[in-house]
Amino acid sequence: QPDAINAPVTCCYNFTNRKISVQRLASYRRITSSKCPKEAVIFKTIVAKEICADPKQKWVQDSMDHLDKQTQTPKT
């Protein structure tokens, strides 16, 4: 889980090694702050849980792409 040491900077120290279906993902944000030890992606799930993930992993990139497309598509 993400850790906010000195708000407002949130850092990830460990990544999930389990793939998570895009069905469970609601949004994401990238962590690129130099105050953090590593770049990360934080996914927010449909039940508002936050999960740290490795942006180098293919499933993470695919999930971000999927969420980007969802955001761009207007609801009918």
């Epitope: 389990r18 793939k19 279906s21 069905q23 469970r24 449909i46 039940v47 849980k49 999960i51 499933w59």
Partner: antibody, heavy 120, light 113 residues
Framework: QVQLVQSGAEVKKPGASVKVSCKVS????????MHWVRQAPGKGLEWMGG????????IHAQKFQGRVIMTEDTSTDTAYMELSSLRSEDTAVYYC?????????????WGQGTLVTVSS | DIVMTQSPDSLAVSLGERATINCKSS????????????LVWYQQKPGQPPKLLIY???TRESGVPDRFSGSGSGTDFTLTISSLQAEDVAVYYC?????????FGQGTKVEIK
């Protein structure tokens, strides 16, 4: 394509423990979130527990708390479910199950089942 | 935990006729942001593990015949077999996957009349 192959049938005495294995092929176990579901004879499906990446840990149904241990051997891609203090009502087919597309909360891939009979 | 209740417990339908199974959740399993319902249907034949038929309440899994359809939203859902075939004799289960723990309905047994 994920394949799950479970260990064979077991007969146990009340009070004993049973350990059921589930061997994963086609994926590595660490990519998957393995869950366990049981089914008593002529009854419905009952979720026992499994790895929940949203909580970052293995979670169990309340009724099995303290009696079930779910473990993984990543070197052999094998998941295990150990149930202790067995009673006759634990007689059931035990399934391992997962979602090969990543953790969704439902299961599109199931093991063949392991029948555990508890009888004195 | 979300409680799932199916009805009826069993039904007998003539070959070629329609079979309808209902599933009700104790709270809404609709995620409003994507307008998706987090409900699946499984089919289980004797001596076999369950087989996933439908996810997101109405999306058929690959390879599932189009006589199977799912509908409903919020708390009330239906699985319909439009024209029952002999191979459809089985027990059908709904399951919610909106929140943890995942919970199943008690099952509906479908037989031929």
């Amino acid at each position: 394509q994920v394949q799950l192959v479970q260990s064979g049938a077991e007969v146990k005495k009340p009070g004993a423990s049973v350990k059921v294995s589930c061997k994963v092929s086609g994926y590595t176990l660490t990519e998957l979130s393995m869950h366990w579901v049981r089914q008593a004879p002529g009854k419905g499906l009952e979720w026992m527990g499994g790895f929940d990446p949203e909580n970052g840990e293995t979670i169990h149904a309340q009724k099995f708390q303290g009696r079930v241990i779910m473990t993984e051997d990543t070197s052999t891609d094998t998941a295990y479910m150990e149930l202790s203090s067995l009673r006759s009502e634990d007689t059931a087919v035990y399934y391992c199950a997962t979602d090969q597309g990543g953790y969704s909360g439902y299961f599109d891939c199931w093991g063949q089942g392991t029948l555990v009979t508890v009888s004195s | 935990d979300i409680v799932m209740t199916q009805s009826p417990d069993s039904l007998a339908v003539s070959l070629g006729e329609r079979a309808t199974i209902n599933c009700k959740s104790s709270q809404s399993i609709l995620y409003s942001s994507n307008n998706k319902n987090y409900l699946v249907w499984y089919q289980q034949k004797p001596g076999q593990p369950p087989k996933l038929l439908i996810y997101w309440a109405s999306t058929r899994e690959s390879g599932v015949p189009d006589r199977f359809s799912g509908s409903g939203s919020g708390t009330d859902f239906t699985l319909t077999i439009s024209s029952l075939q002999a191979e459809d004799v089985a027990v059908y289960y709904c399951q919610q996957y909106y929140s943890s723990p995942p919970t199943f309905g008690q099952g509906t047994k479908v037989e031929i009349k």
